[in-house]
């Protein structure tokens, strides 16, 4: 009696179970009474990453330098190429199909997490006692200067964008 279900790594066709092609190979002929499933290796710049019955291999992803992309990991017959972004840029999506310039943190904000090839800069507001007076993709919030440790006094209070201004203590004559 013809099977209605097949084992793992097999598929049902014409009332018989045929072997799937292994990763890195495509299907060129279903099995017959007289022959096993016939598979052929994927060509250069092609891949298939699963046991399959695909008649065409997938093209490796192209990391387009015009979109700021570069190859992070070269594809094989069993894996796709992995793209990442050039220095200073990051992917716009998980698939990394294009890149955008890393965001800078405005004055009053510092870098909480430096950007990577796949994630943008994460900024945070400088809390009380810290400041950032530049727009930067790298600078964290800096602590206000401690006037006391320099035997100075605060002449102008700091903000989230400016450091305190220290000055000499008023001496009693």
């Amino acid at each position: 009696e013809p099977p209605t279900a097949c084992r793992e790594k097999q598929y049902l066709i014409n009332s018989q179970c045929c072997s799937l092609c292994q990763p890195g190979q495509k299907l060129v002929s279903d099995c017959t009474e007289f022959t096993e499933t016939e598979c052929l290796p994927c060509g250069e710049s092609e891949f298939l990453d699963t046991w399959n019955r695909e008649t065409h291999c997938h093209q490796h992803k192209y990391c387009d330098p015009n979109l700021g992309l570069r190859v992070q990991q070269k594809g094989t017959s069993e894996t796709d190429t992995i793209c990442t972004c050039e220095e200073g840029w990051h992917c716009t999506s998980e698939a990394c199909e294009s890149c955008v310039l890393h965001r800078s943190c405005s004055p009053g904000f510092g870098v909480k997490q430096i950007a990577t090839g796949v994630s943008d800069t994460i900024c945070e507001p400088c809390p009380v006692g810290f400041f950032s007076n530049v727009s930067s993709a790298f600078e964290k919030c800096h602590p206000w200067t401690s006037c006391e440790t320099k035997d100075l006094v605060v002449q102008q209070a700091g903000t989230n964008k400016t450091d305190v201004v220290c000055g000499p203590q008023d001496r009693l004559r």
């Epitope: 007289f34 022959t35 096993e36």
Partner: antibody, heavy 114, light 112 residues
Amino acid sequence: QVQLQESGPGLVKPSETLSLTCTVSGFSLPTSGVHWIRQPPGKGLEWIGVIWAGGDTNYNPSLKSRVTISKDNSKNQVFLKLSSVTAADTAVYYCLGHGHFDVWGQGTLVTVSS
Amino acid sequence: EIVLTQSPGTLSLSPGERATLSCRSSQSLVHSSGNTYLQWYQQKPGQAPRLLIYKVSNRFSGIPDRFSGSGSGTDFTLTISRLEPEDFAVYYCSQTTHVPWTFGQGTKVEIK
């Protein structure tokens, strides 16, 4: 029913290219492969190669540098070319549908001689 | 490539006798799927080969039951239980487990 018919010149000069055609009926070239097999007079059978449904090919490594198999789906024809032939290529050439091993063409004798 | 060696080269027998033909493979013909793609063909002068047995022991439709195939791995046998006059011919084993497909050199069964 499945039928295959080989045709081509019966005589080829040494160093020339042997060209044969296999015309098929009863099955579809876009969904089935076709094999070429040959048999020198009084000798055994030798698998030459196959063209698969999608146009991919496999060749016998011993002949790979000289063999080309192609096809024209619209004409139901498969073509065999064997270059730089010698007397050792004198044989009956058969075509065979993949999965139809019970049905062979009647074969065509090709003699390589000057 | 897989080499199939058939023996004997020639078998001289009388009608009604039993014929036992051997085919030995240089490596296993068992596919990873568990199937073994070993065929037997009969060929008469001036004719194309005729499929008798496929996958070691399956008789093709219309083939008389005096023909049977057996074996596994690398050793295979075609048996003709009682030779009929029309059985005198050349017999080839063939493997389609591995590309390139290969054939044995043939065993001629002739009338004694």
